[in-house]
């Protein structure tokens, strides 16, 4: 099965790369606008210039295009702990990220929140914190991992998964008690 092309792709595919088909006259191929600009008026005829205008402040286009309007610059989400890495220019959107010693947790494809990297207290760093992943910790004996923190086995309830991890510790405690009662 041949996938269906959208109207815009169909129109563009008739013209060579870097050009698009005139919306009112499909025998004319107009040159696309450079990044940082948008289409103000289509070219009046073959070999004639397309009227492209520079994006206004607060907007951008990141690739060659024939958009009637520039795209609005993204704003970094303070409520998600985001900070601005680089500001928006006419040809590049705002780049948002996290502070030092933080990582991004993606709640969805286009929404991330910044969280502090785990320090692995009562454990050791197995994998260092990365841009999009928290530190991976390995806990010391007598501790188990809960939400990426090393928690004392004394907080382990029977019904929880930690019983497997804390069982040797519990047995050791019992063994010590038993040996002292003879």
């Amino acid at each position: 099965l041949v996938p269906h092309l959208g109207d815009r792709e169909k129109r563009d595919s008739v013209c060579p790369q870097g050009k698009y088909i005139h919306p009112q006259n499909n025998s004319i191929c107009c040159t696309k606008c450079h990044k940082g600009t948008y289409l103000y008026n289509d070219c009046p005829g073959p070999g004639q210039d397309t009227d492209c205008r520079e994006c206004e402040s607060g907007s951008f286009t990141a690739s060659e295009n024939h958009l009637r309007h520039c795209l609005s610059c993204s704003k970094c989400r303070k409520e998600m702990g985001q900070v601005e890495i680089s500001s928006c220019t006419v040809d590049r959107d705002t780049v948002c990220g996290c502070r030092k010693n933080q990582y991004r947790h993606y709640w969805s494809e286009n929404l991330f929140q910044c969280f502090n990297c785990s320090l692995c207290l009562n454990g050791t760093v197995h994998l260092s914190c990365q841009e999009k992943q928290n530190t991976v910790c390995t806990c010391h004996a007598g501790f188990f991992l809960r939400e990426n923190e090393c928690v004392s086995c004394s907080n382990c309830k029977k019904s929880l998964e930690c019983t497997k991890l804390c069982l040797p510790q519990i047995e050791n405690v019992k063994g010590t008690e038993d040996s002292g009662t003879t």
Partner: nanobody
Framework: EVQLLESGGGMVQPGGSLRLSCAAP????????MVWVRQAPGKGLEWVSH????????YYADSVKGRFTISRDNSKNTLYLQMNSLRAEDTAVYYC????????????WGQGTLVTVSS
């Protein structure tokens, strides 16, 4: 113990509207960013919309943009979600929660309210 109480769910026809509420008694509501998440049958949690503590910064998932509106009334400790032009794919249990601070799991959230969109 903090309890978030959602209400306003129900059965509605495609194209219809509902307004969900989330009451947060005994909660420092005005210092919390709040979020609506939903879980469709047999699916994972989806972040639907959130609102900053100031009430100004808002976010909507692409799937609900232009149809849903999030708002809050700090004097009533209540969060709202106005849902218009409902579709079958909006059928889910809707939960309100505070935006997590320490790590990517929800500290406080409610029991949920079921929204069913069906003709």
């Amino acid at each position: 113990e903090v309890q978030l109480l959602e209400s306003g769910g129900g059965m509605v026809q495609p194209g219809g509207s509902l307004r969900l509420s989330c009451a947060a008694p005994g909660f420092t509501f005005e210092h919390e960013g709040m979020v609506w998440v939903r879980q469709a049958p047999g699916k994972g949690l989806e972040w639907v919309s959130h609102i900053g503590e100031d009430g100004q910064s808002t976010y909507y998932a692409d799937s609900v943009k232009g149809r849903f509106t999030i708002s809050r009334d700090n004097s009533k400790n209540t969060l709202y979600l106005q849902m218009n032009s409902l579709r079958a794919e909006d059928t889910a249990v809707y939960y309100c929660a505070s935006i997590p601070k320490a790590g990517p799991s929800f500290d406080y959230w409610g029991q949920g309210t079921l929204v069913t969109v069906s003709s």
